[in-house]
């Protein structure tokens, strides 16, 4: 599922870029894609450790 077209608005009024769960916003293609395509943090089993700042997945980012 993709985001609908933005409404026209001024340059100083940024439009939101929401993504559905399990999708993340790709800054280069400028639309939502499956998070797995973007090397996003992956949820891990309880007790697993990681060297990266792996917070809860935030698909809208």
């Amino acid at each position: 599922m993709r985001r609908g077209p933005r409404s026209l608005r001024g340059r100083d009024a940024p439009a939101p870029t929401p993504c559905v769960p399990a999708e993340c916003f790709d800054l280069l293609v400028r639309h939502c894609v499956a998070c797995g395509l973007l090397r996003t943090p992956r949820p891990k089993p309880a007790g697993a450790s990681s060297p990266a700042p792996r917070t809860a997945l935030q698909p809208q980012e």
Epitope: P14, A15, P16, T17, C24, F25, D26, L27, L28, V29, C35, G36, L37, L38, R39, T40, P41, A52, P53, L57, Q58, Q60, E61
Partner: antibody, heavy 118, light 113 residues
């Protein structure tokens, strides 16, 4: 843990060509964006370009006509083909992975030196 | 392209000093999704850069608490609250909001006084 290893640097004459390689381990290059960043001696960092999970490429506009990024997914390796090299292309070339949630360069290779000189 | 301007270009400081580096962008770095993709890297001679701070103020894993980032819009700051011997390096700000291209500041070299 993702690791990147560059190779292919060296001395090349002005007008010549060179291909750099970046071998990735610990992650597949079919996910994410895989970048080249260069640093001229004593200078700052300059983004060269990248190749995406789909094989799409993006370039620094100042370099696009001379530099080409490609990949071989079977080798989990991506490349930087540099043509019509100039003295000002002398730099350490780093490959780097991009975090797709926060959009920072989260993993870097060790760098490979390219010297363009006659 | 977005221009990133750091100041100062270099500074001399002593161990224990508080150090502040500023970074100014030519346009606001607030993305239409509400996020500000401004990051800070540390680089030591002969080594690849390392991420310190992401999205303005978030310390990367393993980065000491003496490093902090702040700012908004076009003006950002990296602060080292108490400079340690291992902190002598060059620091770069970088933006990923308006891409391509990804752009970096020219760097700030922190030297021993």
């Amino acid at each position: 843990e993702v690791q990147l290893v560059e190779s292919g640097g060296g001395l090349v004459q002005p007008g010549g060509s060179l291909r750099l390689s970046c071998a990735a381990s610990g992650d597949s290059i079919t996910s994410g964006y895989w970048n080249w960043v260069r640093q001229a001696p004593g200078k700052g960092l300059e983004w060269v370009g990248n190749i995406s999970y789909s094989g799409s490429t993006y370039y620094n506009p100042s370099l696009k006509s001379r530099f080409t990024i490609s990949r071989d997914t079977s080798k989990n390796t991506f490349y930087l083909q540099m043509n019509s090299l100039r003295a000002e292309d002398t730099a350490v070339y780093y490959c780097a992975g991009l975090d797709g949630l926060y959009w920072y360069f989260d993993v870097w290779g060790q760098g490979t030196l390219v010297t363009v000189s006659s | 392209d977005i221009q990133m301007t750091q100041s100062p270009s270099s500074l001399s400081a002593s161990v224990g000093d508080r150090v502040t580096i500023t970074c100014r962008s030519s346009q606001s770095l607030v993305h239409s999704n509400g996020n500000t993709y401004l990051h800070w890297y540390q680089q030591k001679p002969g080594k690849a850069p390392k991420l310190l701070i992401y999205k303005v103020s978030n310390r990367f894993s393993g980065v000491p608490s003496r490093f902090s980032g702040s700012g908004s819009g076009t003006d950002f700051t990296l602060t080292i609250s108490s400079l340690q011997p291992e902190d002598f390096a060059t620091y770069y700000c970088s933006q990923s909001t308006h891409v391509p291209p990804f752009t970096f500041g020219q760097g700030t070299k922190v030297e021993i006084k």
